[in-house]
């Protein structure tokens, strides 16, 4: 599941990693766009082993993965991959 959240919270990520995470290990991805208290875009990945990590949005592998998920979400209706939550 890929999610985009708009919140008024400050930055969530303490440290970001560029280390590749194979898709089979990923349970969920959340994208927090910059603004609303945090000056940078944040990407949070929940792994299937019950750990959680912030991924550097500039990491090539996460950009490629998000592009694949975007394409998949636009072609598999009616269930959207993006969930926009606007408080």
């Amino acid at each position: 599941v890929l999610e985009v959240y708009y919140t008024s919270l400050r930055c969530r990520c303490v440290q970001e990693s560029s280390v590749f995470i194979p898709r089979r290990f990923i349970d969920r991805i959340q994208i927090l766009p910059r603004g609303n208290g945090c000056p940078r875009k944040e990407i949070i990945v929940w792994k299937k082993n019950k750990s959680i990590v912030c991924v550097d949005p500039q990491a090539e592998w996460i950009q490629r993965m998000m592009e694949v998920l975007r394409k998949r979400s636009s072609s598999t209706l009616p269930v959207p991959v993006f969930k926009r939550k606007i408080p």
């Epitope: 969530r12 990520c13 303490v14 929940w46 019950k50 959680i52």
Partner: antibody, heavy 122, light 107 residues
Framework: QVTLKESGPGILQPSQTLSLTCTFS??????????VGWIRQPSGKGLEWLAN???????YYNPSLINRLTISKNTSNNQAFLKITNVDAPDTATYYC??????????????WGQGIMVTVSS | DIQMTQSPSSLSASLGDRITMTCQAS??????LIWFQQKPGKSPWPVIY???NLASGVPSRFSGSRSGSHYSLTISSLESEDMADYHC?????????FGSGTKLEIK
């Protein structure tokens, strides 16, 4: 607010099975990212992590005790359970349950119960 | 399993002193380390998470740092309410492991 409370027998005999219940409020184990863990502390000593159970029924155990531990939950009753088989004197300790929420920033065991003192004695 | 070696086991200091306690990890745990404070007869409570971040409501005299595999908790000016046991916890990987604890006493 988040609260947790442990319950179970205060005393039991060697070779018996210890059954502990954690009753909690302020969160639900049906919510994505929620978990409950069990930790114990012998009197005057350090903490020892025992087990975790997560919203999706994923379970993790301390390998040194894995053959004796069973963690489970009743989501609708807001309860988590821990069973320890074949107890002996070294299992005498205060047992705590604690919440973990898999969010960023991740702070496992951010809320704890008051603890329950368990004595194993013949 | 990752071993967490905590020192000293006990520490006696005067009010206003600067004190430091340490945990050493046997394997790489990144920044995934928490310090818990446990006051006498009470449950543990997080004071520092992700090695150096102050938990909500914790006074700014508490701080955490890392040097390689050594993780430190420092209290810059000791107050009487800081008398407690302190435990480190690594949560990089299962099984989660605690240090053996540091008992902080006031002289």
């Amino acid at each position: 607010q988040v609260t947790l409370k442990e319950s179970g027998p205060g005393i039991l005999q060697p070779s018996q099975t210890l059954s502990l219940t954690c009753t909690f409020s302020g969160f639900s184990l049906s919510t994505y990212g929620m978990g409950v863990g069990w930790i114990r502390q012998p009197s005057g000593k350090g903490l020892e992590w025992l087990a975790n159970i997560w919203w999706d029924d994923d379970k993790y155990y301390n390998p040194s005790l894995i053959n004796r531990l069973t963690i489970s939950k009743n989501t609708s009753n807001n309860q988590a359970f821990l069973k320890i088989t074949n107890v002996d004197a070294p299992d005498t300790a205060t047992y705590y349950c604690a919440r973990s929420e898999l969010v960023m920033p991740y702070v496992p065991f951010d809320f704890w119960g008051q603890g329950i003192m368990v004595t194993v004695s013949s | 399993d990752i071993q967490m070696t905590q020192s000293p086991s006990s520490l006696s200091a005067s009010l206003g002193d600067r004190i430091t306690m340490t945990c050493q990890a046997s394997q790489d745990i990144g920044i995934e380390l928490i310090w818990f404070q446990q006051k006498p007869g009470k449950s543990p409570w997080p004071v520092i998470y992700y090695t150096a971040n102050l938990a909500s409501g914790v006074p700014s005299r508490f701080s955490g740092s890392r040097s390689g595999s050594h993780y430190s908790l420092t209290i810059s000016s000791l107050e009487s309410e800081d008398m407690a046991d302190y435990h480190c916890l690594q949560y990089k990987q299962y099984p989660f492991t605690f240090g053996s604890g540091t008992k902080l006493e006031i002289k």
